[in-house]
């Protein structure tokens, strides 16, 4: 006899990285017929929702109108059908960004590289942080962690065209409080370049495209909650 229901999916919209003072919605998707959903924050009950009518709703939303460092941390949710509770969802790491300062991101040997070359990103922030995060924009938001006094190095190894894309970095003051994002660096990987001598380092589009990133990520996120859930779960562990 089944003692628990399948675990729900948990994710954040528009993104798990939330600029301070901005809004975010934590979504929990269970089963139709669930009469109660509970959202837990750092192991304690945070909010409850009872969908009406339960048989027509399989997802609830917990709205946070004003993100701050106290709201950043690990969330999970569970749901109940009758007297039977589900397994807890995977953990969602909700991160507050735009704290304090802005790091700078550079790439060696440059933003235009040839397939097979080894590439290293350098993220630098002069204020008190020793953890840095490098993100490649895209649906699953790959995150790498690095450590250093004022800068961290992120070696990519011999690159392929799969490494193409736009990268940003953050300084991390703790696991869930990050700096402003760096300016983007767009990495172009080609099989052969006529001449990459002194290929420009500067970004190919302006800083305000961070908003566009959140939107494109959201679009992908809605297509594949399971992948997003897994990414968020493994983000900082």
């Amino acid at each position: 006899q089944q003692q628990t229901l399948p675990k729900p999916f948990i994710w954040a919209e528009p993104h798990f990285m939330v600029p301070k003072e901005k809004q975010v919605t934590i979504c929990c998707q269970g089963n139709y017929g669930a009469v109660e959903y509970q959202l837990h924050f750092e192991g304690s009950l945070f909010a409850v929702d009872r969908p009406k009518p339960p048989e027509r709703i399989n997802k609830v939303q917990f709205y946070i109108p004003d993100m701050n460092s106290r709201m950043a941390g690990q969330y999970s949710c569970i749901y109940r059908v009758g007297e039977l509770w589900s397994e807890p969802s995977n953990l969602l790491d909700l991160v507050v960004t735009e704290m304090y300062d802005t790091p700078t991101l550079s790439v060696h040997p440059g933003p235009e590289v040839i397939s097979g070359e080894k590439v290293t990103f350098y993220c630098r922030l002069d204020t008190a942080t020793s953890m840095f995060l490098l993100l490649k924009e895209g649906r699953s938001s790959h995150v790498q962690r690095g450590y250093g006094k004022v800068q961290a190095e992120f070696p990519l190894g011999p690159v392929t065209t799969a490494h193409r894309g736009t990268y940003r970095c953050f300084g991390s003051y703790n696991n869930h409080a990050w700096s402003f994002p760096s300016e983007p660096v767009k990495l172009l990987v080609t099989g052969d370049i006529e001449n990459t001598s002194l290929a420009p380092e500067d970004p190919t589009f302006p800083a305000d495209t961070w908003g566009t990133y959140l939107l494109t990520t959201e679009t992908g996120l809605q297509k594949d909650h399971a992948l997003w859930d897994h990414t968020a779960q493994n983000l900082l562990r």
């Epitope: 700078t104 040997p109 097979g116 070359e117 630098r124 011999p158 001598s197 002194l198 380092e201 500067d202």
Partner: antibody, heavy 115, light 107 residues
Framework: QVQLQQPGAELVKPGASVKLSCKAS????????MHWVKQRPGQGLEWIGM????????NYNEKFKSKATLTVDKSSSTAYMQLSSLTSEDSAVYYC????????WGQGTTLTVSS | DIQMTQSPSSLSASLGERVSLTCRAS??????LNWLQQEPDGTIKRLIY???SLDSGVPKRFSGSRSGSDYSLTISSLESEDFVDYYC?????????FGSGTKLEIK
């Protein structure tokens, strides 16, 4: 065209410090890594380190970490390398090179450490 | 640190001859390898970057290739100005390291 201008020679006394310069032109200085390389008379080349003028990010060869300090002056598009506590072992030609792949090279500065 | 073992250390050859210089990397460097030319007055110029890409303005008689951890610079037909020193340089991993150099002499 791309140019990296370095003084031809510097003569300094043992124990002193020296600041070598490398003035860049013909490209957007702040966008490119600047490297420094040492060559002792009749010897091969040794990479000292690099600096990115825009971010200030640096990467040093461990061997030169206590000897060399790399800086830039963005307003004059000039890269600098300060060498401290000089000894005769520091007598060498020092080259700057621009670009992540050491694309372009200066003519080198001959540093002589002698009393 | 990555060691770059360059051979030969010196090479005597005739005008018009085809020669190859080799560097062996002690660790994987991908295609992050340059070939540099140094003239007697100390002037350094890059010939090849990313293992096989020819720098602009460099004669087509110069070419670069790779076989496993061995990287080669080939000069297809030697001209008088080619009799100078050559170095390989890996820029894959810090500290970047140079080969010990090859002195190309006229026979």
């Amino acid at each position: 065209q791309v140019q990296l201008q370095q003084p031809g020679a510097e003569l300094v006394k043992p124990g002193a410090s020296v600041k070598l310069s490398c003035k860049a032109s013909g490209f957007t200085f702040t966008n490119y890594w600047m490297h420094w390389v040492k060559q002792r008379p009749g010897q091969g080349l040794e990479w000292i380190g690099m600096i990115h003028p825009n971010s200030g990010s640096t990467n040093y060869n461990e061997k030169f970490k206590s000897k060399a300090t790399l800086t830039v002056d963005k307003s004059s598009s000039t890269a600098y390398m300060q060498l401290s506590s000089l000894t005769s072992e520091d007598s060498a030609v020092y080259y700057c090179a621009g670009g992540g792949r050491l694309d372009y090279w200066g003519q080198g500065t001959t540093l002589t450490v002698s009393s | 640190d990555i060691q770059m073992t360059q051979s030969p250390s010196s090479l005597s050859a005739s005008l018009g001859e085809r020669v190859s210089l080799t560097c062996r990397a002690s660790q994987d460097i991908g295609s992050s390898l340059n070939w540099l030319q140094q003239e007697p007055d100390g002037t350094i110029k890059r010939l090849i970057y990313a293992t096989s890409s020819l720098d602009s303005g460099v004669p087509k008689r110069f070419s670069g290739s790779r076989s496993g951890s061995d990287y080669s610079l080939t000069i297809s037909s030697l001209e008088s100005e080619d009799f100078v020193d050559y170095y390989c340089l890996q820029y894959a991993s810090s500290p970047f390291t140079f080969g010990s150099g090859t002195k190309l002499e006229i026979k």
